[in-house]
C-alpha cells in the first residue's frame, strides 16, 4: 500500500502535488508499512478494541486562515476516555478517585509503556530497532526522552505527508508559500504503541484556508453605547475602531502596515499607521464604513541570475528547467516585498443618545419622622443628548467594588433633562454611588463618593465628585 491509499479517499493529482510542495513533507506515493502500522477501514470492528476503556478522540485545530507565505499551525489533542490521562512518563494512567462505568481501577495503568520499553529486546547500541520507525520506514528521531512519546501522528494534505512522534498533544507548522489559495483539507491519523507494532486509535480531518487577503477584524466601541455588538452607535461621541490582524505566525511583524479608513460620512479618507482610530459622527443615519489594510509582506522571489560562465571543467551538464519537474532549489535570503491587502466593511447606524450625565447637587432630605439609621438623599441630575427613560443607582462600599444595593426605575424627564433621584442609605459612612441614565441605545454613567453623617441635626452631607 501507498500513503495515499491509507490516508486519503482519492489519490491526489500530479498537478496538485506539483503546485503545493511543502518543505520537509514527503510524497504520498511512498510505500506504507502495513505490517507495523495496520490499516483499518471505517466501521472495522477492530476500532472498538483499539483502546482500553473506550474510544480516543483526536481533536484537530488550526490557526487558519493563513495569509499565503505565512506559517499555519495545526494542533492535535487526544481526548482519552473518562478517568484516563497521560502521566509525566508518557504512560496512560487512571486518575485518582475517579469513577467510570467500570468503577475504581485497582491497576493504576491503562498502558504502562515504560515497563514495556525497559524489557524490550532486539535493539542495537543506538537504542534503535526495526520497530522504532515511522510508517515509511524512517527511524524515530532520538530526542531526549523520546521513549516517553508513544503516539505516532501522520499528517496528510495536498498529496504529501508528515510523520511525528509525540505525546497526547502535538503541533505541526507548515509554510504556505507554495500552497494554492483557497480551502484545503488536512487529515491526521494517530497510532499508539502496541508491543512491537502500532495500532490506529483515531482519525480526524479539518479544513484550513490559505488566502491572499490579510485577515482583518475590527472591534468598535463607544462610551455610553448600550450594545456594542449591534453596530448602532451614538451621534456626537467618538467611536473607537480597533483593527486586529489575524497573523498568529507573526508573518507581518516587520511590515509597515497602513490603515486607510472611509467612514462614509463625506469626511474623506483617513490614512493611519495606528491600528486604533477614533471617529465621531455628527449626523444621524446609516453609514458604510470601509477599511483597507495594506502591508508590505515577504513574497515570491525570482531565482538568482545564472552565474557568469567559468572556464570549462569536466562537470555533468544540467538540463533546462523542467527536466526534473519535482526539483526545488534552495530559496535565497532575498527579501522580496509585495503589497498585501485586507478589507473590512460594515454598515453602522448612528442615532441620538445620552451623551453625558452629571450630579449637580446632593441634598439630605430631612424626614419629619426619621427612620432608625436611615437617611434619604436627593441627587439632582442633568444630562445632555437624548432624554433618558430609566435611571439606575448602584450603592456600594467606598472602593466601589462591593455592591450593597441596586435600584432601577423608569423615569419621566422633561426636555431640559433635569431630574431628582431620591435614594435611601442605611447608616452613616462613606458610600460610592454609581448613577446611570439609560434609553434604548445608550447608557450614561456618573459616579460620586458621598459621606452620610450620623443622624445628628447639626451634621451636613458631604459629596466628593
Amino acid at each position: 500500500k501507498r500513503f495515499h491509499d491509507v490516508l486519503g479517499n482519492e489519490r491526489p493529482s500530479a498537478y496538485m502535488r506539483e503546485h503545493n510542495q511543502l518543505n520537509g513533507w514527503s510524497s504520498d506515493e511512498n510505500d506504507w508499512n502495513e505490517k507495523l502500522y495496520p490499516v483499518w477501514k471505517r466501521g472495522d470492528m477492530r476500532w472498538k478494541n483499539s483502546w482500553k476503556g473506550g474510544r480516543v478522540q483526536a481533536v484537530l485545530t488550526s490557526d487558519s486562515p493563513a495569509l499565503v507565505g505565512s506559517n499555519i499551525t495545526f494542533v492535535v489533542n487526544l481526548v482519552f476516555p473518562r478517568c484516563q490521562k497521560e502521566d509525566a512518563n508518557g504512560n496512560i494512567v487512571y486518575e485518582k478517585n475517579c469513577r467510570n462505568e467500570a468503577g475504581l481501577s485497582a491497576d493504576p495503568y491503562v498502558y504502562n509503556w515504560t515497563a514495556w520499553s525497559e524489557d524490550s529486546d532486539g535493539e542495537n547500541g543506538t537504542g534503535q530497532s526495526h520497530h522504532n520507525v515511522f510508517p515509511d520506514g524512517k527511524p524515530f528521531p532520538h530526542h531526549p526522552g523520546w521513549r516517553r512519546w508513544n503516539f505516532v501522528y501522520v499528517f496528510h494534505t495536498l498529496g504529501q505527508y508528515f510523520q511525528k512522534l509525540g505525546r497526547c498533544s502535538v503541533r505541526v507548522s507548515v509554510n504556505t508559500a507554495n500552497v494554492t489559495l483557497g480551502p484545503q483539507l488536512m487529515e491526521v491519523t494517530v497510532y499508539r504503541r502496541h508491543g512491537r507494532a502500532y495500532v490506529p486509535i483515531a482519525q480526524v480531518k479539518d479544513v484550513y484556508v490559505v488566502t491572499d487577503q490579510i485577515p482583518v477584524f475590527v472591534t468598535m466601541s463607544q462610551k455610553n453605547d448600550r450594545n456594542s455588538s449591534d453596530e448602532t452607535f451614538l451621534k456626537d461621541l467618538p467611536i473607537t475602531f480597533d483593527v486586529l490582524i489575524h497573523d498568529p505566525s507573526h508573518f507581518l511583524n516587520y511590515s509597515t502596515i497602513n490603515y486607510k479608513w472611509s467612514f462614509g460620512d463625506n469626511t474623506g479618507l483617513f490614512v493611519s499607521i495606528n491600528h486604533t482610530v477614533n471617529h465621531t459622527y455628527v449626523l444621524n443615519g446609516t453609514f458604510s464604513l470601509n477599511l483597507t489594510v495594506k502591508a508590505a509582506a515577504p513574497g515570491p522571489c525570482p531565482p538568482p541570475p545564472p552565474p557568469p560562465p567559468r572556464p570549462p571543467k569536466p562537470t555533468p551538464s544540467l538540463g533546462p528547467a523542467g527536466d526534473n519537474p519535482l526539483g526545488l532549489s534552495e530559496i535565497p535570503d532575498e527579501n522580496c516585498q509585495i503589497n498585501r491587502y485586507g478589507h473590512f466593511q460594515a454598515t453602522i447606524t448612528i442615532v441620538e443618545g445620552i451623551l453625558e450625565v452629571n450630579i449637580i447637587q446632593t441634598t439630605d432630605v430631612l424626614m419629619l419622622v426619621p427612620g432608625p439609621d436611615s437617611s434619604l438623599i436627593d441627587f439632582v441630575v442633568t444630562c445632555q443628548g437624548s432624554i433618558p427613560t430609566e435611571v439606575c443607582t448602584i450603592i456600594s462600599d467606598p472602593t466601589c467594588e462591593i455592591t450593597q444595593n441596586a435600584v432601577c426605575s423608569p423615569v419621566d424627564v422633561d426636555e431640559m433633562c433635569l431630574l431628582t433621584v431620591r435614594r435611601a442609605f442605611n447608616g452613616s459612612g462613606t458610600y460610592c454611588v454609581n448613577l446611570t441614565l439609560g434609553d434604548d441605545t445608550s447608557l450614561a454613567l456618573t459616579s460620586t463618593l458621598i459621606s452620610v453623617p450620623d443622624r445628628d441635626p447639626a451634621s451636613s452631607l458631604r459629596m466628593a465628585n
Epitope: S13, A14, Y15, A177, L181, P300, P303, P325
Partner: antibody
Amino acid sequence: EVKLVESGGGLVQPGRSLKLSCAASGFNFYDYWMGWVRQAPGKGLEWIGEINKDSRTINYTPFLKDRFTISRDNAQNTLYLQMSKLGSEDTAIYYCAREGRVPFDYWGQGVMVTVSS
Amino acid sequence: DIQMTQSPSSMSVSLGDTVTIPCRASQDVGSYVNWFQQKPGKSPRHMIYRATNLADGVPSRFSGSRSGADYSLTISSLESEDVADYHCQQYAEYPLTFGSGTKLEIK
C-alpha cells in the same frame, strides 16, 4: 475582474524565434502558477507548459521543452513564452492561462502565430 | 501520456434538448477532469472541475459526471448560446492533456 492579454504574435519565418507576452490584471499575479496552451487551426487544445510563482519550477510538455522557454516578471505582472526554431507545425493561437486550484481557470483572448515563408 | 478521447467530434442537436458530451481517459485519472467551452473565435471558458463541480458563474443547466474512465458533460435544455466546442482535459498526470473537442451544432 481577471484579465489576461497576450501580445507579440504575427507572421514569422521558419527557423526564426518569437517572444509572446501576457499581461495580467485583476488578481495577484505573484500568487498563481501560470501556463501556456496553444490551438492549431481546426485542431484541439495542446498544453505547452507552466511556471510556478517564483519561477523556480517550470514544467513543459516533453516534445516542446528544447525550443520553448517560459518565464515571468512578477513586478510587471507579465508572463512570457520564448519560442525558437519555429516550424509550420507551430502555427496556432497561443493562449496564456491562470492556474489555480485547477488548471486554466481563466484564459486570455489568444494571439495568432503564423509560421510561413 | 494520457489520451483523452472525445468521440463524436461533432453532434447535431435541437434547442431545448438534453445533450451529453462524452470523454474517455486512456488510464485512471480519478476525478481530475476539467471541461471547457469554446465559442467560435473565442478563448476557452472553464465550465467544470474535478469532473462534477461547476466553475464560478456557470449556469446550473450544465453538469458533469464520471463512471470509471468515462466522463461526460451534460447540458439540460440546450440554449442557442451553448453552441460551441467542448473540450475535456485531465490533470491527474503530467503532461496535462486535452481531448480533441466535440462541436455542438444546431439541427
